[in-house]
């Protein structure tokens, strides 16, 4: 499965549609930056069979895809750019999907690494329990679509590796 | 690896206009701000203002607000300073620094060579 | 805008001393706060970034510590390559300020 081929022009999209998104100045929202821990291991690649790395990237884009998915998102971000996002999160999501099936029988280790999706759940509930102690304000999504704009950058480093591993 | 590379040193007369600029290179050139820092000679350092170049959002410094405009074209990677009339008081060493924007990561982790600017007549 | 105080403004000491520098903050700036180095003719280094986190390659000897309105930044044992100027800096809002300035000399 050539991941990348289909799956790296809609990360890109996404990224662009993401930077399109914001509705305040940033630069009034210094002091909402929070540390959402961020798993980078889990993004680094090497302890994982290819399988296992695409089991990781869809749950976050999954995870994703939840959160942006929220009544309290829908009343912050423009409608047209976020039904543009949610497309390009099922393409990816599809992509990757079909990825999965392909690699069943190939190797010998298991599809999925529970550890890995648990600690990118995990990364995901924080970032949750972040934007309800802080009410959902428009800052606290400003900070929330930095952060998944930067997850989104590194997990295309991953994709990257993947190719390379082909 | 990453870099910010400044232009080369001025020299210019009072009034005279002057833009400088920092190109950034080793890492995705919108995913971080671009701000910019003053040091009077032997004295400390001034923070003159920031621009992120996804959208050239631009914040400044009250001791420098309708003093320079901060400028970039993300299209080569290249953020600048300007000024459309020098005063001998803008004779400084003029640094840019890369910032994280909102991310939990360290400001101004990477710093360009430094400009210096010297106005006189 | 929120000022910054360092102390002292110099200080010398010797290879091998503890060095401690202060920085306060005119109002609370929870861990917003950034040490960097400077030596003569060259940029400013990042030394430490939200109060206590070392940045990547900075040597170990060099701690920070404090939230809210006081912090520290401690070289545990100068070496001839510390002398320099040390800034604290504030990151929680516009506009960013920098301290004065620690000069610090060889005895």
């Known amino acids: 499965c050539d991941l990348p081929q289909t799956h790296s022009l809609s990360n890109r999209r996404t990224l662009m549609i993401m930077a399109q998104m914001g509705r305040i100045s940033p630069f009034s929202c210094l002091k909402d930056r929070h540390d959402f821990g961020f798993p980078q291991e889990e993004f680094d690649g090497n302890q994982f069979q290819k399988a296992q790395a695409i089991s990781v990237l869809h749950e976050m884009i999954q995870q994703t895809f939840n959160l942006f998915s929220t009544k309290d998102s829908s009343a912050t971000w423009d409608e047209t750019l976020l039904d543009k996002f949610y497309t390009e999160l099922y393409q990816q999501l599809n992509d990757l999907e079909a990825c999965m099936m392909q690699e069943v029988g190939v190797e010998d280790t298991p599809l999925m690494n529970v550890d890995s999706i648990l600690t990118v759940r995990k990364y995901f509930q924080r970032i949750t329990l972040y934007l309800t102690e802080k009410k959902y304000s428009p800052c606290a999504w400003e900070v929330v679509r930095a952060e998944i704009m930067r997850s989104f950058s590194l997990s295309a480093n991953l994709q990257e590796r993947l190719r390379r591993k082909e | 690896e990453v870099q910010l590379v400044q232009s080369g040193a001025e020299v210019k007369k009072p009034g005279e206009s002057l833009k400088i600029s920092c190109k950034g290179s080793?890492?995705?050139?919108?995913?971080?701000?671009i701000g910019w820092v003053r040091q009077m000679p032997g004295k400390g350092l001034e923070w003159m203002g920031i621009?992120?170049?996804?959208?050239?959002?631009?914040a400044y410094s009250p001791s420098f607000q309708g003093q320079v405009t901060i400028s970039a074209d993300k299209s080569i990677s290249t953020a600048y300073l300007q000024w459309s009339s020098l005063k001998a008081s803008d004779t400084a060493m003029y640094y840019c620094?890369?910032?994280?924007?909102?991310?939990?990561?360290?400001?101004?982790?990477?710093w360009g060579q430094g400009t210096l600017v010297t106005v006189s007549s | 805008d929120i000022q910054m105080t360092q102390s002292p403004s110099s200080l010398s000491a010797s290879v091998g001393d503890r060095v401690t520098i202060t920085c306060r903050a005119s109002?609370?700036?929870?861990?917003?706060l950034n040490w960097y180095q400077q030596k003569p003719g060259k940029a400013p280094k990042l030394l430490i970034y939200?109060?206590?986190s070392l940045q990547s390659g900075v040597p170990s000897r060099f701690s920070g510590s404090g939230s809210g309105t006081d912090f520290t930044l401690t070289i545990s044992s100068l070496q001839p390559e510390d002398f320099a100027t040390y800034y604290c800096?504030?990151?929680?809002?516009?506009?960013?300020?920098f301290g004065q300035g620690t000069k610090v000399e060889i005895k």
């Open positions: 620094a890369r910032h994280p924007g909102l991310n939990w990561a360290p400001d101004f982790d990477y």
């Open positions: 080793g890492y995705s050139f919108t995913s971080y701000w």
């Open positions: 621009i992120d170049p996804s959208d050239s959002d631009t």
């Open positions: 109002q609370s700036i929870a861990e917003f």
């Open positions: 939200f109060a206590s």
């Open positions: 800096q504030q990151s929680i809002d516009f506009p960013l300020t």
